[in-house]
Interface confidence: medium
């Protein structure tokens, strides 16, 4: 059964863009006019979870690729990864928990909390060219993003 999908570019609150740096890693960096088209476009699917006034369960795929952000436990720490999926089966309204994020809108910004690991968020570092990761909102890490809609 088809599910609702919208397409977005994400930038962190420092205006760093997200780019695919190798087959399975996202990095955050500032892009200028010439290479702005390097930033990834996310396919946001509205999936199984518990929606509320301030949280909407979504899955985040990379448009045109069979890759989804997922959250898994590695060496005792919740970890963000890009996971390859079967394009015949994904996206679906009932995604495995590791693919589900609670999209939380805070003023004009948005945060993405792991459904599998509450209080862990998609995060970027202050520094340039660092991987996007799953953080627990500590220190200087950035968890607030802006979403730019992209026509399908």
């Amino acid at each position: 059964v088809p599910i609702r999908q919208l397409h977005y570019r994400l930038r962190d609150e420092q205006q760093k863009s997200l780019v695919l740096s190798d087959p399975y890693e996202l990095k955050a960096l500032h892009l200028n006019g010439q290479n702005i088209n390097q930033q990834v476009i996310f396919s946001m699917s509205f999936v199984q979870g518990e929606p509320s006034n301030d949280k909407i369960p979504v899955a985040l795929g990379l448009k045109g690729k069979n890759l989804y952000l997922s959250c898994v436990m590695k060496d005792g720490t919740p970890t963000l990864q890009l996971e390859s999926v079967d394009p015949k089966q994904y996206p679906k309204k009932k995604m495995e928990k590791r693919f589900v994020f609670n999209k939380i809108e805070v003023k004009s910004k948005v945060e993405f909390e792991s459904a599998e690991f509450p209080n862990w968020y998609i995060s970027t570092s202050q520094a340039e060219h660092k991987p996007v990761f799953l953080g627990n909102n500590s220190g200087q890490d950035i968890i607030d993003f802006t979403m730019e809609s992209v026509s399908s």
């Epitope: 059964v1 088809p2 509205f46 199984q48 979870g49 518990e50 929606p51 089966q89 679906k92 309204k93 009932k94 495995e96 928990k97 590791r98």
Partner: antibody
């Protein structure tokens, strides 16, 4: 308050086609998925399939070749058709709503219709 | 096709805690749901998304799900909790119910 009211023939002969309809009263029709489930006498529940308002369907693989679920949005109704029935299809058939607010699970059910297949 | 396995029956004394299990391959990767069904009635959702309670369901009902097992726990079990309980999950695009557990409240 949401209500699901279902009806259809209760007694069939082997090889006939089972037809049931479920009407939805209260609440939006387009925001949900609509499902059919059955329960043979004294046994457990079996999911048959689902449909959304646009007519997109999902079926249980074990029944897929015999099942058709359709929707009539103008009447807020959806229907089940099961062809070539046998005694093994004797069951109480339920219609139900799958809601996003409960994680796309079945939160409202019809009253059930007992369908008996007998020669 | 996925299989969800439940014990056929569980007995508990009034006021005690009843635990009903549901096992399936990597069930903890998915969301589990629980339904209560009394004789002659349609099923009623009692737990959704592993551990959430719909409005109107008493606090004594709780759920958990990890590894290969989801568990429905009824604390302070009452006579009116006597019923069949079904777990429910999904496999790829289709839904799967467990075989059901008959909960008997003794006495």
């Amino acid at each position: 308050q949401v209500q699901l009211q279902q009806w259809g023939a209760g007694l069939l002969k082997p090889s006939e086609t089972l037809s049931l309809t479920c009407a939805v009263y209260g609440g939006s029709f387009s925001d949900y998925y609509w499902s059919w489930i059955r329960q043979p006498p004294g046994k457990g529940l079996e999911w048959i399939g689902e449909i959304d308002h646009s007519g997109s369907t999902n079926y249980n693989p074990s029944l897929k070749s015999r099942v058709t679920i359709s929707v009539d949005t103008s009447r807020n109704q959806f229907s089940l058709s099961l062809s070539s029935v046998t005694a093994a299809d004797t069951a109480v058939y339920y219609c139900a709503r799958a809601s996003p607010s409960s994680g796309w699970t079945l939160d409202y059910w019809g009253q059930g219709t007992l369908v008996t297949v007998s020669s | 096709q996925s299989v969800l396995t439940q014990p056929p029956s569980v007995s508990v004394s009034p006021g005690q805690t009843a635990s009903i299990t549901c096992s399936g391959d990597k069930l903890g990767d998915k969301f589990a749901f629980w339904y209560q069904q009394k004789p002659g009635q349609s099923p009623v959702l009692v737990i959704y998304l592993d551990n959430k309670r719909p409005s109107g369901i008493p606090e004594r009902f709780s759920g958990s799900n990890s590894g290969n097992t989801a568990t429905l726990t009824i604390s302070g079990t009452q006579a009116l909790d006597e019923a069949d309980y079904y777990c429910y999950a999904w496999d790829n695009a289709y839904e799967v119910f467990g075989g059901g557990t008959k909960l008997t409240v003794l006495g």
